[in-house]
């Protein structure tokens, strides 16, 4: 503890200028004071001034008023500092002395004489209020006041509590009268070292190093750090915990960037055609009559079906067509003839037969010719008879289909299986694909044809989720997850509403 006992001398009266021994001072009593402060004693005794002692210079002669003085010699109030816990009780001895010697340091002069002394014993609490008193004896009167206050940075009823205001990272506070800490605005905690974060800042996901701040922990964002950060690259997905990518409806894949509902999101099919989803980013347009193209964007010519007969020429109109008939024919499609067999209307050796009592005719055409007048040479390839991309070739009276690799038959309708020759070694499963066969290898083998024996089984760690089957040998990473219906992803970890078109390669 640490404090100061302060004694304010106010007035001393010694009208007759007498000493304690009854003698008078010549020419007057040049008065100074000795003060002794010690622990409480029921009966004041001589001995050390345990709480401190102090002397004044000469303050006046006989009777005088003592003025307050804050510095230098003759300071008033007198200060008796102590470095212990104030006990609340004390004994005080104030002696008035006459000196014939030095005004400033009378204590050292020989021949000093006692004028009077007073003794005060009692209790005194720490506080700023002065206790005023007056003591008389037969010859003198002393008016004075006193108090005990704590030294700077000491607080409490016994000045025992040290508190220094501070504003650094070990505390942001001022000191209360009792020495307890009073946190500066924006700070809290036992030592006022904890900043009060921005109001609403998430307790777990945010923190602050100074008041009204909200710093987000990894994986969180937003003013209050209450929004999770989705997986980097997550396109059409959200998160409920950091680094998640839960796909929005109609999206799939690790980054929710695979469109499982391309039809709805992009409406690629034109002219009233029907769109059908077929896996990630896949769709098919089914065209209404009169339209063609991948997106049914191309309108078919109204003349495409060759509606004009008997050599009539067809002309497209806005919503229909018009047939220009050759001489001797009439009707919407030039289907009516004004000719008879007498006009020899049949070409290329066709034979004419009269009909309707000779008012019309019909031509019977020789092989390789057709048309109502046998005017057209038969093109056996017009009906696109070759399947699977086969090329049609006219060969005199017949035609042949030249098939693409992997197909055979008159119309290339038969698929030659690449798997027929069993290209997969070590019991691998063969898949016929457009670009050739693919082998799915059993555990322990890899390579295009399962010909490589691997010492490390990539499937051994069980990398596939949701009941997917693990295969090795299909990829550089040596394993493939074949997902069950309803799951996608390199490890079949993401649920979707559609089956994968082919195993995801990990």
């Amino acid at each position: 503890g640490s404090g100061i006992f302060q004694l304010r001398l106010q007035e001393f009266v010694n009208q007759r200028g007498m000493l304690a021994n009854g003698q008078s001072c010549e020419p007057g009593c040049r008065t100074f004071f000795r003060i002794c402060l010690k622990h409480f004693q029921a009966t004041f005794s001589e001995g050390p001034c345990t709480f401190g002692n102090v002397s004044t210079p000469v303050l006046g002669t006989n009777s005088f008023v003592v003025r307050d003085k804050n510095s230098g010699s003759g300071r008033n109030p007198l200060q008796l500092p102590f470095n212990f816990t104030w006990p609340g009780t004390f004994s005080l001895n104030i002696q008035a002395w006459h000196t014939p010697g030095d005004d400033l340091r009378p204590e050292t002069s020989p021949g000093n004489s006692l004028i009077s002394q007073i003794i005060i014993q009692g209790s005194l609490a720490v506080g700023k209020i002065w206790r005023t008193d007056e003591q008389n004896d037969t010859l003198t009167r002393l008016s004075y006041s006193y108090r005990v206050i704590c030294s700077d940075n000491y607080y409490g009823e016994s000045c025992s509590r040290l508190c220094k205001k501070r504003d650094d990272h070990f505390g942001h506070y001022e000191c209360q009268p009792d020495g307890s800490l009073s946190c500066l605005p924006g700070w809290t905690g036992k030592y006022c070292d904890q900043p009060i974060c921005l109001s609403g800042c998430h307790e777990q996901n945010g923190y602050c190093s100074k008041p009204d701040e909200c710093i987000c922990r990894p994986g969180w964002q937003g003013r209050l750090c209450n929004e999770c950060i989705p997986h980097n690259g997550c396109r059409h997905g959200t998160c409920s915990i950091p680094w998640q990518c839960a796909c929005d409806e109609g999206w799939g894949g690790l980054f929710c960037d695979q469109d499982l509902n391309y039809c709805t999101h992009h409406s690629p099919c034109k002219n009233g055609s029907t769109c059908s989803n077929s896996g990630p980013k896949g769709y098919t347009c089914t065209c209404l009559p009169g339209y063609t193209g991948e997106h049914c964007e191309l309108g078919l010519s109204k003349c495409a079906s060759n509606p004009c007969r008997n050599g009539g020429s067809c002309k497209d109109q806005e919503n229909s067509y018009h047939c220009l008939c050759p001489p001797g024919y009439y009707g919407q499609h030039c289907e009516h003839s004004t000719l008879t067999c007498a006009d020899s209307p049949c070409f290329n050796g066709g034979s004419c037969r009269e009909r309707n009592q000779g008012s019309s005719y019909a031509c019977e055409c020789p092989p390789n010719f057709t048309g109502s007048n046998c005017e057209k040479k038969v093109d056996r390839c017009t009906s696109n008879p070759c399947a699977n991309g086969g090329q049609c070739q006219n060969r005199g009276p017949s035609r042949t289909c030249r098939c693409r690799p992997g197909f055979t038959g008159t119309h290339c309708e038969l698929h030659i299986s690449d798997c027929a020759r069993s290209p997969c070694a070590h019991g691998g499963t063969c898949h016929d694909l457009e670009n050739g066969p693919v082998c799915t290898c059993p555990a322990g083998f890899s390579g295009r044809r399962c010909e490589v024996r691997i010492t490390h089984d990539a499937c051994a760690s069980g990398p596939c989720f949701n009941g997917a089957t693990c295969y090795t040998g299909l990829s550089p990473n040596n394993f493939v997850c074949n997902c069950p219906y309803g799951f996608v992803g390199s490890r079949c970890e993401f649920p979707v509403g559609l089956p994968p078109s082919f195993p995801w390669v990990a």
């Epitope: 205001k165 990272h169 905690g189």
Partner: antibody, heavy 121, light 107 residues
Framework: EVQLQESGPGLVKPSETLSLTCTVS??????????WGWIRQPPGKGLEWIGD???????YYNPSLKSRVTISVDTSKNQFSLKLSSVTAADTAVYYC?????????????WGQGTLVTVSS | SYELTQPPSVSVSPGQTASITCSGQ??????ASWYQQKPGQSPVLVIY???KRPSGIPERFSGSNSGDTATLTISGTQPMDEADYYC?????????FGGGTKLTVLG
């Protein structure tokens, strides 16, 4: 009982970066009651405070070194680290890590045994 | 920048009282700590918050701080107290050490 142990290279070339790690054992670095500091002492000279860090990552640096110092904390490993860039011979010193207690007004009640770092080519 | 000044050396006879001072502008308004460092060893905290002793520090170590000066007092000094002593205070968010005082126990 809490113990602190410095580790890192004892020799660093001029202009390079000095890197040291302090491992705390016997207590958690995530305690809200302490800051974790670095202090150095050149041979035959006095102590110089470098900087300190709280478990949340808040850092405080000596203004005279601030442009070159980075202190970081890894609560999962119970470690904190010091990086001092562009070192010169004047950075040769024994480097101490220490625990600074809030309850002691910032006094350092636990110290590592110190590690001598020499800056020389 | 804030500075703390200590005398480079202080000598004392065994059993006598040694006083080591540390001065800095308005140091009495800050908390002072004192560290003892023996050759080849790490510093040890002997006084914190001006006058408080950590557990395990002998009662002969005491401290005070007012005005511009903090004082470490070792009463009944023993030969084992011979060491370097450093004062330390915080100036805002920066730790500041004094230059250190070598205490020599004579005899």
């Amino acid at each position: 009982e809490v113990q602190l142990q410095e580790s890192g290279p004892g020799l660093v070339k001029p202009s390079e970066t000095l890197s040291l790690t302090c491992t705390v054992s016997g207590g958690s670095i995530s305690s809200s009651s302490y800051y974790w500091g670095w202090i150095r002492q050149p041979p035959g000279k006095g102590l110089e405070w470098i900087g300190d860090i709280y478990y949340t990552g808040s850092t405080y640096y000596n203004p005279s070194l601030k442009s070159r110092v980075t202190i970081s904390v890894d609560t999962s490993k119970n470690q904190f680290s010091l990086k001092l860039s562009s070192v010169t011979a004047a950075d040769t010193a024994v480097y101490y890590c220490a625990r600074q207690a809030l309850a002691l007004g910032g006094g350092s009640d636990k110290w590592g045994q110190g590690t001598l770092v020499t800056v020389s080519s | 920048s804030y500075e703390l000044t200590q005398p480079p050396s202080v000598s004392v006879s065994p059993g006598q009282t040694a006083s080591i001072t540390c001065s800095g502008q308005r140091l009495g308004d800050k908390y002072a700590s004192w560290y003892q460092q023996k050759p080849g060893q790490s510093p040890v905290l002997v006084i914190y918050e001006d006058s408080k002793r950590p557990s395990g520090i002998p009662e002969r170590f005491s401290g005070s701080n007012s005005g511009d000066t903090a004082t470490l007092t070792i009463s009944g000094t023993q030969p084992m107290d011979e060491a370097d002593y450093y004062c330390q205070a915080w100036d805002r968010d920066t730790g500041v050490f004094g230059g250190g005082t070598k205490l020599t126990v004579l005899g």
